[in-house]
């Protein structure tokens, strides 16, 4: 029998905490409240143990802190007396991944809690449509991702495997391009990039609409609708209409759902309908001229999806113009 009040203690199992590159995280640790508290957070790799943060004699002790953690860690000092030994960790890097052990001692007890920290990154990917000479390509691109993602392609909802993958960044984060040659195809394509650690998935969908044949001076309606299966009601997204010409894309209109602002870069361009329900982003292009022939691209993008819709417009000379010649 010892001199103490009785406390129930539930041992904490090893916890896995997932953080994001560049962001802050809390590594949790709790203990039975007591006096004469000492707290040590240590990081263990295959070869060494590093001091992350220490607290004893009533204050933080950082003399032996490893330099990689300088100005990046702190405890919740006003909550230590309540049994909170959690570590606040700033500006995560991929090198911070690993096993952290919290050692806590009080006048009457000693415990360890292990936390496994995993760090991920998933910058919003992009789907790009490119024309190179006579070939057409779809590119799924993620600028910064860790760990390596799972990339899958579908053609008309059927999985396909023939794509060209390029990766940079040997240890991570990785930059990945997955390119598919879609020359001469009228199929719809879908590219999915999944970060299993962060449980984040992004999907890019590409659809080629039937060609539109119009006469000079007429107007053309270019359809582009937001599919509810893809976008949740409160999700921010942007809509960009652009024109592809000789492999170069020029923006015609831009819409942001968050501000509900539209910017037009072409005076003959206007919405088909009022954007009341924010789902139909079809456009009208008026007073067509021969030089308006080409490919028009509607891009609806959020953090989770990109929907690309391609229209090919052929503008032919009107009868009067033809007879004038």
């Amino acid at each position: 029998i010892f001199l103490s009040a009785f406390f129930t203690y539930v041992p904490m199992n090893e916890q896995i905490i997932i953080g994001r590159l560049g962001e802050d995280i809390i590594l949790p640790s709790s203990f039975e409240r007591g006096s004469e508290v000492v707290i040590h957070w240590k990081y263990q790799d295959s070869y060494n143990s590093y001091n992350v943060h220490s607290y004893y004699k009533g204050s933080g002790r950082l003399e032996s802190q490893d330099t990689r953690y300088a100005n990046r860690t702190s405890l919740f000092y006003n909550e230590i007396q309540n049994g909170n030994a959690s570590l606040f960790f700033r500006r995560l890097s991929l090198l911070d991944e690993g096993i952290y052990t919290c050692y806590v001692g009080t006048a009457i007890q000693a415990i360890t809690n292990k936390v496994v920290l995993k760090v991920g990154v998933f910058l919003t990917p992009m789907m790009k449509y490119e024309k190179r000479n006579t070939n057409s390509f779809l590119i799924c691109n993620v600028l910064s991702v860790y760990p390596r993602p799972i990339i899958t392609w579908k053609m008309d909802n059927t999985p396909i495997s023939e794509n060209n993958m390029q990766e940079t960044g040997s240890l991570g984060p990785f930059s990945i391009n997955s390119t598919l040659n879609i020359t001469g195809s009228n199929s719809s394509y879908e590219c999915t990039i999944e970060n299993s650690l962060l449980k984040q998935t992004w999907t890019g969908r590409w659809t080629m609409k039937d060609g539109l044949h119009k006469m000079q001076s007429e107007h053309v309606s270019l359809s582009c609708e937001l599919v509810n299966d893809y976008f949740s009601p409160n999700q921010d997204f942007k809509v960009t209409w652009s024109r592809m010409e000789s492999g170069i894309s020029s923006i015609l209109a831009y819409y942001l759902s968050s501000s509900q602002n539209t910017t037009f870069y072409e005076s003959r361009f206007s919405w088909n309908k009022e954007l009341k329900n924010q789902s139909d982003f079809s456009m009208n292009l008026t007073d067509l001229s021969l030089s308006d022939s080409g490919e028009y691209l509607c891009n609806i993008s959020s953090d989770e999806y990109t929907l690309l819709t391609i229209h090919t417009v052929h503008v032919e000379p009107s009868q009067e113009t033809a007879s004038d010649n």
């Epitope: 010892f2 004469e36 007890q109 000693a110 360890t112």
Partner: antibody, heavy 121, light 106 residues
Framework: EIQLQQTGPELVKPGASLRISCKAS????????IVWVKQNQGKNLDWIEK????????TYNLRFEDKATLTVNKSSTTAYMQLNSLTSEDSAVYYC??????????????WGQGTSITVSS | DIVMTQSHKVMSTSVGDRVSIICKAS??????VAWYQQKPGQSPKLLIY???TRHTGVPDRFTGSGSGTDFILTITNVQSENLANYFC????????FGGGTKLEIK
């Protein structure tokens, strides 16, 4: 070199009191706890009480309540244990040990050589 | 209070053998267990802490394992200088020692 130097053996009469010392050297005295441990003739080890020199606070084993009083002298880096109302049951070897919590050992990493106490009339 | 039990009071072994000293806790102590070696006429000496971490200068022939309630100190390639008493100690809540296991060399 880290050392805990204890006083020599003592022969005392029943009912008497006795103060034994433990002089610490080679480390920062207030950074480590001093634990006192009893080893009886049967070689069993029992912790009696510990003192945190920084706070001056003590935590004791209720089985030794009123048996021991711990103090420290920070300037001389010495820990003391006074044993009261001695009986033959108190005849044993008493060790002071350093309890390391600064480097996460949380164990008694250095021990004194022990002080043998015999209580006999 | 937490009771630490070392069921074998004495264990006999030969030089070069491997021996396992067992310690049981009366309740879950996580890995808050240390092992000490006490040679005849000497003070105890720390061998293992946090159940499996070898203290500085301790030969790698000494290995600690276990968690919860069951703990083992294993000595491989036993040498004559390993003749000693071995104590386990929990520090999850206060401190309690096992009764010790005396290692004898045949």
């Amino acid at each position: 070199e880290i050392q805990l130097q204890q006083t020599g053996p003592e022969l005392v009469k029943p009912g008497a009191s006795l103060r034994i010392s433990c002089k610490a050297s080679g480390y920062s005295f207030t950074d480590y706890i001093i634990v006192w441990v009893k080893q009886n003739q049967g070689k069993n080890l029992d912790w009696i009480e510990k003192i945190n020199p920084y706070y001056g606070t003590t935590t004791y084993n209720l089985r030794f309540e009123d048996k021991a009083t711990l103090t420290v002298n920070k300037s001389s880096t010495t820990a003391y244990m006074q044993l009261n109302s001695l009986t033959s049951e108190d005849s044993a070897v008493y060790y002071c040990a350093r309890w390391d919590y600064v480097s996460t050992l949380f164990a008694m990493d250095y021990w004194g050589q022990g002080t043998s106490i015999t209580v006999s009339s | 209070d937490i009771v630490m039990t070392q069921s074998h009071k004495v264990m006999s072994t030969s030089v070069g053998d491997r021996v396992s000293i067992i310690c049981k806790a009366s309740q879950d102590v996580g890995t808050a267990v240390a092992w000490y070696q006490q040679k005849p006429g000497q003070s105890p000496k720390l061998l293992i802490y946090w159940a499996s971490t070898r203290h500085t200068g301790v030969p790698d022939r000494f290995t600690g394992s276990g968690s919860g309630t069951d703990f083992i100190l294993t000595i491989t390639n036993v040498q004559s200088e390993n003749l000693a008493n071995y104590f386990c100690q929990q520090y999850k809540r206060y401190y309690t020692f096992g009764g010790g296991t005396k290692l004898e060399i045949k």
